[in-house]
Amino acid sequence: KETAFVEVVLFESSPSGDYTTYTTGLTGRFSRAGATLSAEGEIVQMHPLGLCNNNDEEDLYEYGWVGVVKLEQPELDPKPCLTVLGKAKRAVQRGATAVIFDVSENPEAIDQLNQGSEDPLKRPVVYVKGADAIKLMNIVNKQKVARARIQHRPPRQPTEYFDM
């Protein structure tokens, strides 16, 4: 379970039309459910139930986004429509280049993601929890444009990353 180094850049526009970028670094773990690869894309927050619909025409986003899913406590979702692995697969099928799960409220999902699939996804499936998850969700919940870059090596200098 290698460390995933995640950089999140939040873009905030000003009234003059300029924008400011805020970069936040956090760490997660690559799970065995996916590949240990770098990935980058615009963050799309997905509700766990939003991954239930099996309608393949519901590809609302172009390929290359990073899905962020906050898992609920098992008590609040006693009959999940898909396993955590199933949710990751569904997100990738819909065009996610990577999936990040916040497992803070459902840590047993870590075991499920690391059970080792015979057919692991070819995109990274990362999990975060605790303070790192709080940082990520604080950004995601601002509902502003944000991009995530996932790396399996520690980042170098932030200025090298995002080609604007």
Epitope: P74, E75, K79, P107, E108, D111
Partner: antibody, heavy 118, light 110 residues
Framework: EVQLVGSGGGLVQPGRSLKISCAAS????????MAWVRQAPTRGLEWVAT????????YYRDSVKGRFTISREYAKSTLYLQMDDLTSEDTATYFC???????????WGQGVLVTVSS | QAVLTQPNSVSMSLGSTVKLSCTLN????????VHWYQQYEGRSPTTMIY?????PDGVPDRFSGSIDSSSNSAFLTINNVEIGDEAIYFC?????????FGGGTKLTVL
């Protein structure tokens, strides 16, 4: 290998208290909700209590609310059930179980016999 | 209060197929998962079927689970019954935030 080992049972008089334990190994204890399920002699299974993975919430069947307290100790990977004001109706074998997604009890301990009698 | 009802006992001959039922008296059986446990005399229960129809590793494929919404029931089917299948089988679900178990079916193999 997941293992749940119960202990602390015995004979207790009505109105008295008893605390039973369940030592967990073979998995990350802090990831999972845990539960106690009991089985009276020649009877079926009866859910008693559940505690969430982080111990922040616990749930009880109506007949034990206010008398039983489920708790967990992470340093020892141990689940507890404190039983107060016991009655003969509480006589049973108490199983600890791991509670996982879908509200499944996927692994069960070997059972702790609690007999309430004067 | 929701109740899961199972027949008390079923006797089947060696090599036959048995279908054990578990009926929910109120609410929709499809709203929550049904799980099945096997319990030998004096032993702890073990999971045979979870999430309606999933089989844990190590459980023979002779065991299968299903749901029938028309009868509001869950079923555990055991094909090619063996002597070692003689046990009590309990169904379990989580209904209205309460864990409920069926009374158990004692399977006797003749």
């Amino acid at each position: 290998e997941v293992q749940l080992v119960g202990s602390g049972g015995g004979l207790v008089q009505p109105g008295r208290s008893l605390k039973i334990s369940c030592a967990a190994s073979g998995f990350t204890f802090s990831y999972y909700g845990m539960a106690w399920v009991r089985q009276a002699p020649t009877r079926g299974l009866e859910w008693v209590a559940t505690i969430t993975y982080n111990g922040s919430k616990s749930y009880y069947r109506d007949s034990v609310k206010g008398r039983f307290t489920i708790s967990r100790e992470y340093a020892k990977s141990t689940l507890y059930l404190q039983m107060d004001d016991l009655t003969s109706e509480d006589t049973a074998t108490y199983f600890c179980a791991r509670r996982t997604t879908g509200m499944l009890f996927d692994y069960w301990g070997q059972g702790v016999l609690v007999t309430v009698s004067s | 209060q929701a109740v899961l009802t199972q027949p008390n006992s079923v006797s089947m001959s060696l090599g036959s197929t048995v279908k054990l039922s578990c009926t929910l008296n109120s609410g929709n059986i499809e709203n929550n998962f049904v799980h099945w446990y096997q319990q030998y005399e004096g032993r702890s229960p073990t999971t045979m079927i979870y999430n309606d129809d999933k089989r844990p590793d190590g459980v023979p494929d002779r065991f299968s689970g299903s749901i029938d919404s028309s009868s509001n029931s869950a079923f555990l089917t055991i094909n090619n019954v063996e002597i070692g299948d003689e046990a009590i089988y309990f169904c379990h679900s989580f209904v209205s935030s309460i864990h409920i178990f069926g009374g158990g079916t004692k399977l006797t193999v003749l």
